[in-house]
């Protein structure tokens, strides 16, 4: 029976993933019962990705390592809509690392997942980035401009945002 074997496969995948994320929240995609997309609980979901706000304060490198241990990376923001979704879950008095850095200090910004850096889809605060020694990007709130990006020193501990593709089972 097709449905039975699909369910067995799904359960075995869930069991495998449970050792990393004890609880998954899954939804049926479209009308096809075959496709379930999941995010770990209590991650949030938007389009084809899952997001986790890490409130522990760590350097940029440690923040990225923390995300990768969970099967994610520091967040790569591809659209204004994605940023608008993310900021709903952020606190205005905090700053959060993005998956964006300038390792050489030459203003060659790089996303951790190798997505090409596109000047036309960036949300820097006005006047930012402004320091060649500040090689990592955060998102924070400024009363004059609301949410935007700023360059800071990578070793300064911040909160962070992890992003992973939805888990399909």
């Amino acid at each position: 029976n097709f449905m039975y074997s699909k369910t067995v496969k799904r359960l075995s995948k869930l069991r495998e993933y449970q050792q990393y994320h004890p609880s998954l929240t899954c939804v049926m995609e479209g009308k096809d019962i075959e496709d379930w997309s999941c995010c770990p609980t209590p991650w949030t979901s938007f389009q084809s990705s899952c997001y986790f706000i890490s409130t522990g304060m760590q350097s940029w490198t440690k923040s990225q390592k923390n995300c990768s241990v969970m099967g994610a990376d520091l967040v790569v923001i591809n659209t204004r809509e994605e940023q608008d979704f993310i900021i709903q879950n952020l606190k205005r008095n905090s700053s959060y690392f993005l998956g964006l850095s300038d390792p050489g200090g030459r203003r060659h910004w790089q996303w951790v997942d190798q997505t090409p850096y596109n000047e036309n889809v960036t949300f820097w605060h006005s006047g930012e980035p402004n320091n060649l020694d500040e090689r990592c990007a955060i998102i924070n709130f400024r009363s004059s401009e609301e949410w935007g990006w700023n360059d800071i020193h990578c070793h300064v501990p911040q909160k962070s945002i992890c992003k992973m593709k939805k888990i399909y089972i």
Partner: nanobody, 126 residues
């Protein structure tokens, strides 16, 4: 937590072959995307090859395409790098790396990898 141990390095002549092996212990190996990186003295650690969890998707840096082959054996918890037609410029310490992955992609940025082996030296003499 995943522990990785590379083996198979050594000193060979240009044109020779070597097969590197990386043994993984710890969590379910089949849920980890794997990569081979190398670091020559005074240089950055760069990706050589990468492979997805199911072994179906692979990546090679241009300089090794057609000469190196990455493969994995999920039953044995191992990933391999078969290196043929070795050149002096392949001399480096070779590192195996792992990252948890729930998709079917590979990863080419060293920042994407959470776990690393200690490395194995490969020296190619002319």
């Amino acid at each position: 937590q995943v522990q990785l141990q590379e083996s198979g390095g050594g000193l060979v002549q240009a044109g020779d072959s070597l097969k590197l092996s990386c043994a993984a212990s710890g969590r379910t190996f089949s849920t980890y995307a794997m990569g081979w990186f190398r670091q020559a003295p005074g240089k950055e650690r760069d990706v050589v090859a990468a492979i997805a969890t199911n072994g179906g998707t692979t990546y090679y840096v241009d300089s090794v395409k057609g000469r190196f082959t990455i493969s994995r054996d999920n039953a044995q918890n191992r990933v391999y790098l078969q290196m043929n037609s070795l050149k002096p410029e392949d001399t480096a310490i070779y590192y195996c790396a792992a990252r948890l992955s729930f998709g079917s992609g590979y990863y080419t940025n060293k920042l994407n990898y959470a776990y690393w082996g200690q490395g194995t030296q490969v020296t190619v003499s002319s």
